[in-house]
């Protein structure tokens, strides 16, 4: 690490389900990317990570007082979904066009 | 500190305006609470921190590879608006009965 | 800059009515409601309405609720507040101001004087 | 109605003395964290000056000797150096509910 940590944005994160034990019921993809929402939120706030005026207020507060209040996090603000091939109740494989919520489309300040 | 963090939860965060240079267009109230959202996001993840199926991943790579990936961050899900008086261009104060986005109404893993 | 200017002073026997006007302009007329204030000689304030001029919607004093009647003439930026059935008690200056939302009165007109005689 | 009590009736004093008015409300004025209370100046043959809103907080142009303080029920507005031309009657007025109503005023008389 360079001492300097960056600012909020979308980092690849490949997760293999074999490592969190979803292995047993999904069985495609083998792995895929959830991206990971990384880096600070820094003042001023960009438009970029679309921060509510709650975190604009966060900020602001952290700034004077930054050992009483923490700064915004980065985190998901839109998630995607992936497809899926899955066992059913009754073994039979079958297809999840859209499994929401899996994987991170936009990251913002919150 | 006791060394152990709560959970994710929603604690009092009293902000006065003119800490933060609002109280140039912002004139009353004076101070709100924003409320802030504070602890961490444990494996498992509790129903009341109503976690997206990403937090849900994130949180058990974060188990597997805590060095490689963070936890999921405990943020405002829900925002509540507040009332203020502000000056317009006119120089009238006026009512904003909804100012969105101001204070936290639930906390939640994202 | 703001200006609010009244109809001239007006003199009426008891049981008519009179019509006071209120011009406005610096402003966007519709941008902020029309208040009604009166004053009788030597006595202090008494509101009696006000006017939201964009829509029209109005809130009166019960105590005047009865009499009074309160419109707006967008076109040409004026405010009129009528009051019916006039007493002797009814002398008095007639105030128009503008104010927000809030309901705190910023501008005023220089007043209109109404004399209720026999 | 909300009734609004200003007293006293008459304060006189002496030039550069500080003036301290009176306005209880018959109910709380707070909304929002806002009170809604606000206090006029009246010289003779004029119309009223918007002085002071939301209890503490200047009009336009208002010098700066004219402050407002209280909340709830209790408001004061004091000139912390009376000047001759602040020789007036001092209103106070409510803002909170429909009727808006005014207190009966103070008179300020510079000896």
């Known amino acids: 690490s360079t001492g300097a940590s960056s600012h909020c944005q979308k980092t690849s994160l490949r997760v293999n389900f074999e490592d969190i034990g979803w292995d047993s019921w999904i069985i495609a993809p083998k792995e895929y990317d959830a991206y990971e929402c990384k880096g600070g939120c820094f003042f001023p706030l960009a438009d970029d990570v679309t921060p509510t005026k709650h975190a604009i207020v966060q900020t602001l507060v952290h700034l004077k007082f930054p050992t009483k209040v923490g700064k915004a996090c980065c985190v998901p603000t839109k998630l995607s979904p992936i497809s899926i091939l899955y066992k059913d109740d009754m073994g039979v494989p079958t297809l999840k066009y859209h499994y929401e919520g899996m994987s991170v489309a936009e990251c913002g300040c919150r | 500190s006791t060394g152990a963090s709560s959970h994710c939860q929603k604690t009092s965060l009293r902000v006065n305006f003119e800490d933060i240079g609002w109280d140039s267009w912002i004139i009353a109230p004076k101070e709100y609470d924003a409320y802030e959202c504070k602890g961490g996001c444990f494996f498992p993840l509790a129903d009341d921190v109503t976690p997206t199926k990403h937090a849900i991943v994130q949180t058990l790579v974060h188990l597997k590879f805590p060095t490689k990936v963070g936890k999921a961050c405990c943020v405002p899900t829900k925002l509540s608006p507040i009332s203020i008086l502000y000056k317009d261009d006119m120089g009238v104060p006026t009512l904003k009965y909804h100012y969105e986005g101001m204070s936290v109404a639930e906390c939640g893993c994202r | 800059q703001v200006q609010l200017v009244q109809s001239g002073a007006e003199v009426k026997k008891p049981g008519a009515s009179v019509k006071v006007s209120c011009k406005a302009s610096?402003?966007?007329?519709?941008?902020?409601?029309m208040h009604w204030v009166r004053q009788a000689p030597g006595q202090g304030l008494e509101w009696m309405g006000e006017i939201n001029p964009s829509q029209g919607g109005t809130n009166y004093n019960e105590k005047f609720k009865s009499r009074v009647t309160m419109t707006v003439d967008k076109s040409i930026s004026t405010a009129y507040m009528e009051l019916s059935r006039l007493r002797s008690d009814d002398t008095a200056v007639y105030y128009c101001?503008?104010?927000?939302?809030?309901?705190?009165?910023?501008?005023w007109g220089q007043g209109t004087l109404v004399t209720v005689s026999s | 109605e909300i009734v609004l009590t200003q007293s006293p009736a008459t304060l006189s004093l002496s030039p550069g003395e500080r003036a301290t008015l009176s306005c209880r409300a018959s109910?709380?004025?707070?909304?929002?964290?806002?009170?809604?209370m606000n206090w006029f100046q009246q010289k003779p043959g004029q119309a009223p000056r918007f002085l002071i809103y939301a209890a503490s907080n200047q009009g336009s142009g208002i010098p700066a000797r004219f402050s407002g303080s209280g909340s709830g029920t209790d408001f004061t507005l004091t000139i912390s150096s009376l000047q001759p031309e602040d020789t007036a009657v001092y209103f106070c007025q409510q803002s909170k509910e429909v009727p808006r109503t005014f207190g009966g005023g103070t008179k300020v008389e510079i000896k």
């Open positions: 610096g402003y966007t007329f519709t941008r902020y409601w």
């Open positions: 101001a503008i104010g927000s939302n809030y309901g705190g009165l910023v501008y």
């Open positions: 109910e709380s004025l707070d909304n929002y964290g806002i009170s809604f």
